[in-house]
Structure formats: structure tokens, C-alpha cells
């Protein structure tokens, strides 16, 4: 096919998709033109496995990423539950536009959120001490709408301060009890989530939470005698 005479703009460079927890954000480097006073705008389109291309606008995906001057498109800006379904095969493409001129499309490799996501650490970690035990509660890195499709399991990495690290898990629950610890000792711990996607037998190992340390209680029969 002959070259498109209107396709005279350079294409956006280095597009990348950020899939972190529930976030879905496409970003790219701006197209710089020295001889134009008008701003370059960008258009993003997406498609599913067997679908046609759709313009990324409010009607189609809930955010406006057509004729934008920004160099990113946050598909999950409206809410964490917005954006592309996490088990869908999604392809994105992007081009620059200036008046009647436009660049060639830059098409990104397809992704599936559950397959490609970077999973952050569990959040809101709270620990309640017991005698020789620590009860750890936390929330998931992000919400999963259908837990029959995908779910989190959790691991606790823990060690007596100055001692050898141990790992307990996997757990499905957001509450974990570390038992058989020594009374009146300090234990340090990190919690980690792992995302399992049933459909493709894929799992994504998440980041460890920051280290925090906790003293167990003294033996109940002796502690509080005044």
C-alpha cells in the first residue's frame, strides 16, 4: 500500500503499560515538534482477542483517551474496578495527531492483567500480641471481583530478632496466627501475597511488606502480679 500522505508525524516513543495491583496505566514519551505552535494530541485504541478496535473514550472504557495532550492514559482513574476486565486479552495502540496529520499506530504487545500484573504487598497490616503468639490481620493488595476466577493466598516471613527466618503459608485468610512463639520475645515479620489465576494456572508472587517487629506477651500467669 502507498504511504499515507497524512502520516507525517513521528510516532510516540517507548509506550509502556503499568499494571500494578488494580492500576492499568498506559504512558509514552511526548512527540516533540519544533515547527508547530499547536499541541500534539494523542489517541489510544484498544481491542480484545476477536474484536475490532475501539477508541478509548468515556463510552467504551470509562475514561477519555482520545485527542488528549497528556502522555498517559489511566484506564482505572475512575475507580479501581474500572478499566479492562482482568482476565481479558487486551491489545493497545497509540498514535499522535496534529490537525489532519497523524503518526503511524504504535501497537503494544497484548496483555492480560492477571498474567502480567505486579502485585504489591498486603496493606493495613495490624498485629495483636498474645502469649507466645501474634495474630496478623491485613487487607488484600487489591480487590478481586470474582474469587472463583482468581484469588490471593498469603505467606508470612518471620524470625525472632537476630534469628533464622521462617515462612508460614500459604493461607487464604486475611488473618494469620503465628503460634508456638516464645513469650516476651521480639519477632520481625513481612507479609507477602501471591495471586493465583485458575484459568491459566498462573501465579504472580507479590512484593514483601516492610519489615516490622512485635513483642509477644509474657506468660499470663506471671505477668501482672503486682
Amino acid at each position: 500500500a502507498p504511504p499515507d500522505p497524512l502520516s507525517q508525524l513521528p510516532a510516540p516513543q517507548h509506550p509502556k503499560i503499568r499494571l500494578y495491583n488494580a492500576e492499568q496505566v498506559l504512558s509514552w514519551e511526548p512527540v516533540a515538534l519544533s515547527n508547530s505552535t499547536r499541541p500534539v494530541v494523542y489517541q489510544v485504541q484498544f481491542k480484545y482477542t476477536d474484536s475490532k478496535w475501539f477508541t478509548a473514550d468515556i463510552m467504551s472504557i470509562g475514561v477519555n483517551c482520545t485527542q488528549i495532550t497528556a502522555t498517559e492514559c489511566d484506564f482505572t482513574a475512575a475507580s479501581p474496578s474500572a478499566g479492562f476486565p482482568m482476565d481479558f486479552n487486551v491489545t493497545l495502540r497509540l498514535r499522535a495527531e496534529l490537525g489532519a496529520l497523524h503518526s503511524a499506530w504504535v501497537t503494544m504487545p497484548w496483555f492480560q492483567h492477571y498474567r502480567n500484573v505486579t502485585v504489591g504487598p498486603p496493606e493495613n497490616i495490624e498485629v495483636t500480641p498474645g502469649e507466645g503468639s501474634l495474630i496478623i490481620r491485613f487487607s488484600s493488595p487489591f480487590d478481586i471481583a470474582d474469587t472463583s476466577t482468581a484469588f490471593f493466598c498469603y505467606y508470612v516471613h518471620y524470625w525472632e530478632k537476630g534469628g533464622i527466618q521462617q515462612v508460614k503459608g500459604p493461607f487464604r485468610s486475611n488473618s494469620i496466627s503465628l503460634d508456638n512463639l516464645k513469650p516476651s520475645r521480639v519477632y520481625c515479620l513481612q507479609v507477602q501475597a501471591q495471586l493465583l489465576w485458575n484459568k491459566s494456572n498462573i501465579f504472580r508472587v507479590g512484593h514483601l511488606s516492610n519489615i516490622s517487629c512485635y513483642e509477644t506477651m509474657a506468660d499470663a500467669s506471671t505477668e501482672l502480679q503486682q
Epitope: 500480641p129 490481620r137 517487629c213
Partner: nanobody, 123 residues
């Protein structure tokens, strides 16, 4: 370096009410959780109620529906509203705070206890 000041104990008739309060002061970066334990003569210490920063409450089965724990985070103070008191609630009630004093490389929560306040339920 962390002090817990309890108040509100005393003698009350069965079916009566009391409110205990406990204020924490000193070198405090964070308290989580804060709560109440009790110890009757010759018995082991037991948890009465505990409250985390996220609002997760834990109650002993024997006090559920009668006791309510609440907290004023700005004042580092925890309260225990005790209703429909029974003779078996008689004990020394101890305030507990799980405190990060900021003295270590990582957050480190340690157990701090009040001196205890005596609650006697008797006619």
C-alpha cells in the same frame, strides 16, 4: 518511657455500670492495638476487649453484648464501657497498649501495661 494512666474502677452492684479509661503518654510513634485485660485473684490474665486502628474489635465471649470498647486516637486514650456487671466480672482491670516508640531501625511494637484498676461487683 511510656506511661498508662487508668481510672474509673470501683465498687458497683450487680447489674450496674462503670466506664474505665486509660490514657497513654510518653515516647509514642504509634499504638496499635489498645485494650483491656483482667486478672481475678488466683486466675490467669484474660483479654477483655481490644481495638485496632482499623476498628477491629475483639471481645471475650463472657463480655460480648455487655462491654463496649472505644478509643480516642488523638488523645491516645481507650475506654471500656461496662454494663450489666456481674460478680464474676470482679477483677483487676489492666490497660494494655502495643506501642512503637520509634527507638529501633524498624517499627517495633512492645507491650505496655497500666498499674491496674480494681473493679468489684458485689451487693
Amino acid at each position: 518511657q511510656v506511661q498508662l494512666q487508668e481510672s474509673g474502677g470501683g465498687l458497683v452492684q450487680p447489674g450496674g455500670s462503670l466506664t474505665l479509661s486509660c490514657a497513654a503518654s510518653g515516647s509514642i510513634v504509634s499504638i496499635n492495638p489498645m485494650g483491656w485485660y483482667r486478672q481475678a485473684p488466683g486466675k490467669r490474665r484474660e483479654l477483655v476487649a481490644s481495638l485496632t486502628n482499623r476498628g477491629i474489635t475483639t471481645y471475650a465471649d463472657s463480655v460480648k453484648g455487655r462491654f463496649t470498647i472505644s478509643r480516642d486516637n488523638a488523645k491516645n486514650t481507650v475506654y471500656l464501657q461496662m454494663n450489666t456487671l456481674k460478680p464474676e466480672d470482679t477483677a483487676v482491670y489492666y490497660c494494655h497498649a502495643y506501642v512503637d516508640t520509634g527507638n529501633y531501625e524498624y517499627p517495633q511494637y512492645e507491650n505496655y501495661w497500666g498499674q491496674g484498676t480494681l473493679v468489684t461487683v458485689s451487693s
